[in-house]
Each structure stands twice: as C-alpha cells, then as structure tokens.
Amino acid sequence: EDELQVIQPEKSVSVAAGESATLRCAMTSLIPVGPIMWFRGAGAGRELIYNQKEGHFPRVTTVSELTKRNNLDFSISISNITPADAGTYYCVKFRKGSPDDVEFKSGAGTELSVRAKPS
C-alpha cells in the first residue's frame, strides 16, 4: 500500500527581516485520519507554530483556504519575520487517537534563515 508521505520540498528558505516566509508542505494521502501541525525544532522542546484546531497564531496564514475540501496542501506563510524566527520548521501529520493524537510522520524539515533588512 502507498503510505502517506509528508513532502517539504525546500530544504532551506532565506527571507529578509520584515518579509513573509512561505513554508511548503504537501501530503500524498488524506489518511490516516488526523490533523497536521507545524513545529519549529524537533524533540520535546519543539515549538508549536500552527495548529488549525486550537490556539491563536496571528502571524501565520494557510496558503490554501481553510474551507477547501480534501486539501493536501498544508503550506503556511509567516509574516513579519525577525531573526528570532530562524530555525528548522517541520510539517507533522498526526494520527487520531483517544484521548490524544499520536505523531505519525514528519516532513524532512525546512531551515529558515533570516537576512538583514535591506537598507
């Protein structure tokens, strides 16, 4: 069977401070059932960057409309980038669990580097 793949096509993205960064992610399947989230960093100390279902992420917008049916594009855009945003960002598929969802598969990561604002 073709198991779901998480595709982050860019290994790295470089953005000038103050601009927006687009981080691309696509899935090859709608299953297993469960949400997709974005994190910065890996392991226990990773930072949640975007979760559609809960939380408030004012600088993050989704590239595809949130009412799009059977969406396989989970790319995001982060506005007003600062040097503090530098790091490696992971798109992660979770498998629905009870009571908690379980991490199923992660993308390879996209390293965001921040250039100085052009003068």
Partner: antibody, heavy 120, light 108 residues
C-alpha cells in the same frame, strides 16, 4: 461519478453474524477515509465506524462486536458484524469521508444502504 | 460526547416560504457542522459543510450560518422537492461523530 454500492444485508438471528460490503468507484478510494452510518426504522442517523489507513474508530454501541476493514486493491469497504442484537436492526449506509481544512470529517457521498434485520 | 439538538422536530410549510432550522451543540464545535437532507427511502445528501459552505450542485436557496454552539440552515424559498428530513452533524470532536435528531419538513 462517485458510486457506493452496499451488499450483504439480510435477516439474522440474535447472536448471529453478517458481513456487509461496499463497492466504491469514481474516486481514488485508497486515499480517503470511509465510514458506516446506520438508521434504525423510523429513527435518525447513527455513526457506526470509520477507517482511515489501518486506523479504525467505533461507536461504543458496536465496539468489540463489529470490525471495519478495507481492501484497496478491490476498492471495497467491509463491516463484519458479530454477536448481533435486535437493536442493530437498521439500514446500513456506506459513506465516503471528506475532510475540510486541516482536519475534520463529514460524509459527502452515501450508498443507498442495505437493510439488516436481527430477529428470532 | 457532543449532543446536537435540532428544533423544531416538524415543520409544515407552504412552497415559496422561507424556512429556518436550528441545531444547537452541547459544547463549542467551532464551525465543524454539516447539514444533510434525506428524502423518504433515500440516502442522506450533503448540503452544507463547515457551517456555511454549500456542497457542489446544491441550489443557492440553501444557506448555513453559525459558529460555536448555535447553527442555522435556511431555505430562502421552499420548493416542493425540498420535503424530507434535515440533519445536522458535528465533526469537531469525535469519535463519535454525532447527528441531531432531525427536523421533518412537510409540505402544506
């Protein structure tokens, strides 16, 4: 055109077993979750079970008695029903799940249903 | 388990009238509500998802609104083919997916 065709319903005694099938066509079956929803005579809709890849989910009322499965090579969804009870009497619908946004499922296509009657 | 309460249970309406159905959730379901129409002897048919998005091919006389716990399905001008039972369903928190008890629309 999406088509879902259920089969396997019938009359069975309490404690008996039945296996329902749902033949799917017109869409990429293997990448979608699929579900069974039932409707007792004259009653409302009740979700029974959903399958993703190998991830399965059940209503408490059928847990341990019903098993959902799929064969992607045959584009077919199954529901194995054991230890049937009178309260399982219903029309059983096969439904294709649709997602919206980044999670959340509803049912965008339904089969015509197959009637299961549990009676002695 | 999230309980969905639909009201009224039955509506008797004349063609051309505006019809409003209510669906109330026992807790916040954001906008994760779908609406279905079921005619006698037929399978349910998806009308609305994400509280207000019409499914492909659904006439624009059908509209949905609401978020949180209170949702409404409106038929702006009822046609004779709109008789049947209308169900709401939540998909915010599952299992289980839950449906409302339905509102039956009878043609006057």
């Amino acid at each position: 055109e999406v088509q879902l065709v259920e089969s396997g319903g019938g009359v069975v005694q309490p404690g008996g077993s039945l296996r329902l099938s749902c033949a799917a066509s017109g869409f990429s079956f293997s990448i979608y979750a699929m579900s069974w929803v039932r409707q007792a005579p004259g009653k409302g809709l009740e979700w029974v079970s959903t399958i993703g890849a190998d991830d399965t989910y059940y209503a408490d009322s059928v847990k341990g008695r019903f098993t959902i499965s799929r064969d992607n090579s045959k584009n077919t969804l199954y529901l194995q029903m054991n230890s049937l009870r009178a309260e399982d009497t219903a029309v059983y619908y096969c439904a294709k799940d649709s997602t919206v946004g980044w999670s959340g499922d509803f049912f965008d296509y339904w089969g015509q249903g197959t009637l299961v009657t549990v009676s002695s | 388990e999230i309980v969905l309460t639909q009201s009224p249970a039955t509506l008797s309406v004349s063609p051309g009238e505006r019809v409003t159905f209510s669906c109330r959730a026992s807790q916040n379901v954001r906008s994760d509500i779908a609406w279905y129409q079921q005619k006698p002897g037929q399978a349910p048919r998806l009308l609305i998802y994400a509280a207000s998005s019409r499914d492909t091919g659904i006439p624009d006389r059908f509209s949905g609104s609401g978020s949180g716990t209170d949702f409404t399905l409106t038929i702006s001008s009822l046609q004779s083919e709109d008789f049947g039972v209308y169900y709401c369903q939540q998909y915010y928190d599952w299992p289980p997916f839950t449906f409302g008890g339905g509102t039956k629309v009878e043609i006057k």
